[in-house]
Amino acid sequence: MMTGTIETTGNISAEKGGSIILQCHLSSTTAQVTQVNWEQQDQLLAICNADLGWHISPSFKDRVAPGPGLGLTLQSLTVNDTGEYFCIYHTYPDGTYTGRIFLEVLESSVAEHGARFQIP
């Protein structure tokens, strides 16, 4: 039975040209996290594998940095980066948990950043 829950940064906004941290946290389960996939729509951005390490998709490696933790840092943001992002936790023995983050990249310099998410 899957008892875990995913907490995410939720809906966030950031300025064009800036950077943002996408963060998820899996709680309320003792399942072992084997791998976390970060995806934008149907595109794989990055993989954080508990054993094998990080892999950033070649088409994103100039603008995506691993971490902090299991999170992902997006850099040099453009308005085209606006959209849904998913953290997909592959765990044993529970299975798959998915979290959703909506990022809006604004032209304005008055973009309100969502509260910074911290893993306890």
Partner: antibody, heavy 127, light 107 residues
């Protein structure tokens, strides 16, 4: 730190039996598949057997089917290889290896790689 | 059983040179291929998984490419510690199989 320590190797006569053990530490043993891989002196690597996390599925290379049995005791964090009807061609260093799982989202399946290995134990089958 | 054929059997090169190792599968293994390095008296070390992804702690001079039946491991500039035997392995299906190995030796 992941540690795998094999034991039980030695000299045995053709037709004899031997039981290898692999003591695991530094990780949650029951969450990982395990394998045995062997290497004959001066030769290449040969995968021998694999066992799933709960022991429910086992796979073997054809040359050892019916003679070797892979098993595990999750309470003892131990992997075993029972080798019967041993032949001269079974002479090798036997490594225990822990599976590292990689999920391929494009094909919706898991792949299993060997990230962690023991130091090996030598089995010599000779009269 | 999927047979993996590695070539060349031996590669004689000098430090600083580029090494290109080949692994050919008898049938498609998609991207389910790994490369390992083994030095005398030591257990193998995972270098590359999923054909092209570097495992944790592996230097950037090691790179893998290929899909289907033809794969390549490239060492862009050989360091003294890179002289060893390299094996490819398919994990597409059981039985898992290894190639015969390529020995990279100092010229």
């Amino acid at each position: 730190e992941v540690q795998l320590v094999e034991s039980g190797g030695g000299l045995v006569q053709p037709g004899g039996s031997l039981r290898l053990s692999c003591a695991a530490s530094g990780f949650t043993f029951s969450s990982y598949g395990m394998s045995w891989v062997r290497q004959a002196p001066g030769k290449g690597l040969e995968w021998v057997a694999n066992i799933k996390q709960d022991g429910s599925e086992k796979y073997y290379v054809d040359s050892v089917k019916g003679r070797f049995t892979i098993s595990r005791d999750n309470a003892k964090n131990s992997l075993y290889l029972q080798m019967n009807s041993l032949r001269a061609e079974d002479t090798a260093v036997y490594y225990c290896a822990r599976v590292s799982y990689y999920y391929d989202s494009s094909k919706l399946r898991w792949a299993e790689y060997f990230q962690h290995w023991g130091q090996g134990t030598l089995v010599t089958v000779s009269s | 059983e999927i047979v993996l054929t590695q070539s060349p059997a031996t590669l004689s090169l000098s430090p600083g040179e580029r090494a290109t190792l080949s692994c050919r599968a008898s049938q498609s293994v998609s991207s389910y291929l790994a490369w390992y390095q083994q030095k005398p008296g030591q257990a193998p070390r995972l270098l590359i998984y999923d054909a092209s992804k570097r495992a944790t702690g592996i230097p950037a001079r090691f790179s893998g490419s290929g899909s289907g039946t033809d794969f390549t491991l490239t060492i862009s500039s050989l360091e003294p510690e890179d002289f060893a035997v390299y094996y490819c392995q398919q994990v597409h299906n059981f039985p898992l199989t290894f190639g015969g190995g390529t020995k990279v030796e100092i010229k």
